[in-house]
């Protein structure tokens, strides 16, 4: 004969646990139903009646099967330097992230505590390491034969175009200018962009000083103060 299915509430066998989506009520000493996500326990179970669940009120939520007497409050509205990437619903909390072009300069358990604009590399400097959700852009001077003529948090240094005859040689912030109608080979058809920040955890690294134009002018050095950040300008 098939084993009889117990309906909640029921007394568990000695030494056994309640089933999935059930909890043991200490007062009733019975296995009782949990409430589904988006609900909470309005009335706890007794020996003869199961848990009575009710929907979460506006601006409150439960994300898991539960038997909490009250739903959790959704977080405050996103700060003005953040955007809402997940709305508050009955089943999930609001999630705020730094707005595009910004990164999380200080993370806390509840989310991002402080957002800051991504550093922009000035002309003559390109992105050496792109920004992420939790780390700033790192800039580097354009090496000989490459240039960047933009103030950007995404543009890298691009190769100078190759000319049959050079009218004006290229430098770190300007492409070469050719005298002929067209260069023999253009190495730089257009600006090269790095992808926008992706979600990665920042490590406790010590980047070398790189010039930048952003508000975030921070570099960890092994010893003492840094030299002037050449070519660093405002936005």
């Amino acid at each position: 004969l098939p084993a009889q299915v117990a309906f909640t509430p029921y007394a568990p066998e000695p030494g056994s646990t309640c089933r999935l989506r059930e909890y043991y009520d200490q007062t009733a000493q019975m296995c009782c139903s949990k409430c589904s996500p988006g609900q909470h326990a309005k009335v706890f179970c007794t020996k003869t009646s199961d848990t009575v669940c009710d929907s979460c009120e506006d601006s409150t939520y439960t994300q898991l099967w539960n038997w909490v007497p009250e739903c959790l409050s959704c977080g405050s509205r996103c700060s003005s330097d953040q955007v809402e990437t997940q709305a508050c619903t009955r089943e999930q909390n609001r999630i705020c992230t730094c707005r595009p072009g910004w990164y999380c300069a200080l993370s806390k358990q509840e989310g991002c505590r402080l957002c800051a604009p991504l550093r922009k590399c000035r002309p003559g400097f390109g992105v050496a390491r792109p920004g992420t959700e939790t780390s700033d852009v790192v800039c580097k001077p354009c090496a000989p034969g490459t240039f960047s003529n933009t103030t950007s948090s995404t543009d890298i240094c691009r190769p100078h175009q190759i000319c049959n005859v050079v009218a004006i040689p290229g430098n770190a912030s300007m492409d070469a200018v050719c005298t002929s109608t067209s260069p023999t080979r253009s190495m730089a058809p257009g600006a090269v962009h790095l992808p926008q920040p992706v979600s990665t955890r920042s490590q406790h690294t010590q980047p070398t000083p790189e010039p930048s134009t952003a508000p975030s002018t921070s570099f960890l050095l092994p010893m003492g103060p840094s030299p002037p950040a050449e070519g660093s300008t405002g936005d």
Partner: antibody, heavy 116, light 112 residues
Framework: QVQLVQSGAEVKKPGASVTVSCKAS????????IIWVRQAPGQGLEWMGW????????NSAQKLQDRVTMTTDTSTSTAYMELRSLRSDDTAVYYC?????????WGQGTLVTVSS | DIVMTQTPLSSPVTLGQPASISCRSS???????????LSWLQQRPGQPPRLLIY???SRFSGVPDRFSGSGAGTDFTLKISRVEAEDVGVYYC?????????FGRGTKLEIK
Amino acid sequence: QVQLVQSGAEVKKPGASVTVSCKASGYTFSTYGIIWVRQAPGQGLEWMGWISAFNSNANSAQKLQDRVTMTTDTSTSTAYMELRSLRSDDTAVYYCARGEDFFDYWGQGTLVTVSS
Amino acid sequence: DIVMTQTPLSSPVTLGQPASISCRSSQSLVHSDGNTYLSWLQQRPGQPPRLLIYKVSSRFSGVPDRFSGSGAGTDFTLKISRVEAEDVGVYYCTQSTQFPFTFGRGTKLEIK
């Protein structure tokens, strides 16, 4: 006890650079940020910037961002603030303070005088 | 940027009497984490600033209980229940909810 001790007074010519140091003791340096604030003679407090002693993330006031560099050296629990291309209106007492949620401990201040 | 407006700019008070300083922010200081990062600093003549109140109403250690902070959103108040001679100085409100951190212009407390 928590202490922030700053470097001594400086007299600089216009166009020069100055570096102010802020040595922390009495707490784990890398678990807090450091802010830099300045106060011109007879004026109020002006926020210059903040740096994380943990990962070097930072932010500075827009009007200063092309002239200021903040650094930290975790091996000596010291924060540094360098201000370049000094002008006479940069004459001020420069303070470091601990924190980001609030600023609970302050350095004694460093007077920087810019004069030709 | 969030602008912090303090009133009054100067406050002459009698010893033993209460004093009140108001601070208004140009936008809400409630962070998405639920905290309001509004602090009050005291600066006595010739000294560095000193933290009195943080997160609107929490008194920092060692601060006398005659100092209290209140408010929410954009309107905040620092109260001194009975002014003492050592309270003379300039009081600043400051927000650290978001960059750039900003200070009020300060309120000078002086004895009548």
